[in-house]
Interface confidence: medium
């Protein structure tokens, strides 16, 4: 039975050219996290954090994605094209798969503030 819940940074905004932290947190379960996958809105994989092997950043994003903090992901040198949904997928044993959603809006304005509050989707 899947008892866990994924908390995410929810809807966030950040400045063009800046950076942003995408963060998910799995709680209310004793399941072992074997892997966390980070995907972009078009379903392309940004990065994988495997419990045994550590981080793998996919080549297309190598220059703009930094692993962490923790199981999160830092997107750098943001462009307007980075606006959209991001998904964290937690592969766990024995529960199975948990999925969280974050919506990132990249703003041209210099007054854009990076809001990062945790919320349960």
């Amino acid at each position: 039975m899947m008892t866990g819940t994924i908390e995410t940074t929810g809807n966030i905004s950040a400045k063009k050219g800046g950076s942003v932290i995408l963060q998910c947190h799995l709680s209310s379960t004793m399941a072992q996290v074997t892997q966390v996958n980070w995907e972009q809105h078009d379903h392309s994989l940004l990065a994988i954090r495997n419990a045994e092997l550590g981080w793998h950043i996919y080549p297309a994003f190598k220059d703009r994605v930094a692993p962490g903090p923790g199981l999160g992901l830092t997107l750098q040198s943001l462009t307007m094209n980075d606006t959209g949904e991001y998904f964290c997928t937690y592969h766990t044993y024995p529960d199975g798969t948990y999925r969280g959603r974050i919506f990132l809006e990249v703003l041209e304005s210099s007054v854009a503030e990076h809001s990062a509050r945790f919320q349960i989707p």
Epitope: H56, K62, H91
Partner: antibody
Framework: QVQLVQSGAEVKKPGASVKVSCKAS????????MHWVRQAPGQGLEWMGV????????SYAQKFQGRVTLTRDTSTSTVYMELSSLRSEDTAVYYC??????????????WGQGTMVTVSS | EIVLTQSPGTLSLSPGERATLSCRAS???????LAWYQQKPGQAPRLLIY???SRATGIPDRFSGSGSGTDFTLTISRLEPEDFAVYYC?????????FGGGTKVEIK
């Protein structure tokens, strides 16, 4: 050019252990992950495990967990695969294969020539 | 783990003909993280295609890969004598990395 040269054929008794070596040349040894794959006679390919550039990170297929150990010796640019508690079903050709990427991509780009391990009483 | 099923098991064709090999995944292989390998008798496998459609270094352009999600295809446009071999697909979406059972392309 990139080359992986494996140790020679082995004949072992059931219950024994075998240690196969894979010597790398033609690239920066400490930058790439190394996979091990086996192939029983007339059968398909079976991934066994992978070891990271420093040797600190390893991941094994569940089937081999507890029986296989991957290690690497940076001074000789050699990776080792040790399989214990051998049984007749372990009779196979064992291959080392270098990863395609300096992160672990899972793409096996360059292969050793293979080492035949025969388990027989 | 992701199970890959290849079909047909054996393909009997003549040199010059077109070969179409299929690989089906038990679940979606996101972003086309699928590779194809060629293996000749007594030899180690050789990487042909990665990313479902990108040819590895030195692979002739008669080899092409396509597909996404759960269905992938390797096409050899015109079989050369040296192409008769066993072909394996492999997913590298996430560990444990798995291979299909293989398709043998033999001379008719």
């Amino acid at each position: 050019q990139v080359q992986l040269v494996q140790s020679g054929a082995e004949v072992k008794k059931p219950g024994a252990s075998v240690k196969v070596s894979c010597k790398a040349s033609g690239y920066t040894f400490t930058s790439y992950y190394m996979h091990w794959v086996r192939q029983a006679p007339g059968q398909g390919l079976e991934w066994m495990g992978v070891i990271g550039p420093s040797g600190a990170s390893t991941s094994y297929a569940q089937k081999f967990q507890g029986r296989v150990t991957l290690t690497r010796d940076t001074s000789t640019s050699t990776v080792y695969m040790e399989l214990s508690s051998l049984r007749s079903e372990d009779t196979a050709v064992y291959y080392c294969a270098r990863d395609h990427s300096d992160y672990w991509s899972g793409i096996m780009e360059v292969w050793g020539q293979g080492t035949m391990v025969t388990v027989s009483s | 783990e992701i199970v890959l099923t290849q079909s047909p098991g054996t393909l009997s064709l003549s040199p010059g003909e077109r070969a179409t090999l299929s690989c089906r995944a038990s679940q979606s292989v996101r972003s086309s993280y699928l590779a194809w390998y060629q293996q000749k008798p007594g030899q180690a496998p050789r990487l042909l295609i990665y990313g479902a459609s990108s040819r590895a270094t030195g692979i002739p352009d008669r080899f092409s890969g396509s597909g996404s999600g759960t269905d992938f295809t390797l096409t050899i446009s015109r079989l050369e004598p040296e192409d008769f071999a066993v072909y394996y697909c492999q997913q590298y979406f996430s560990p444990p990395w798995t291979f299909g059972g293989g398709t043998k392309v033999e001379i008719k």
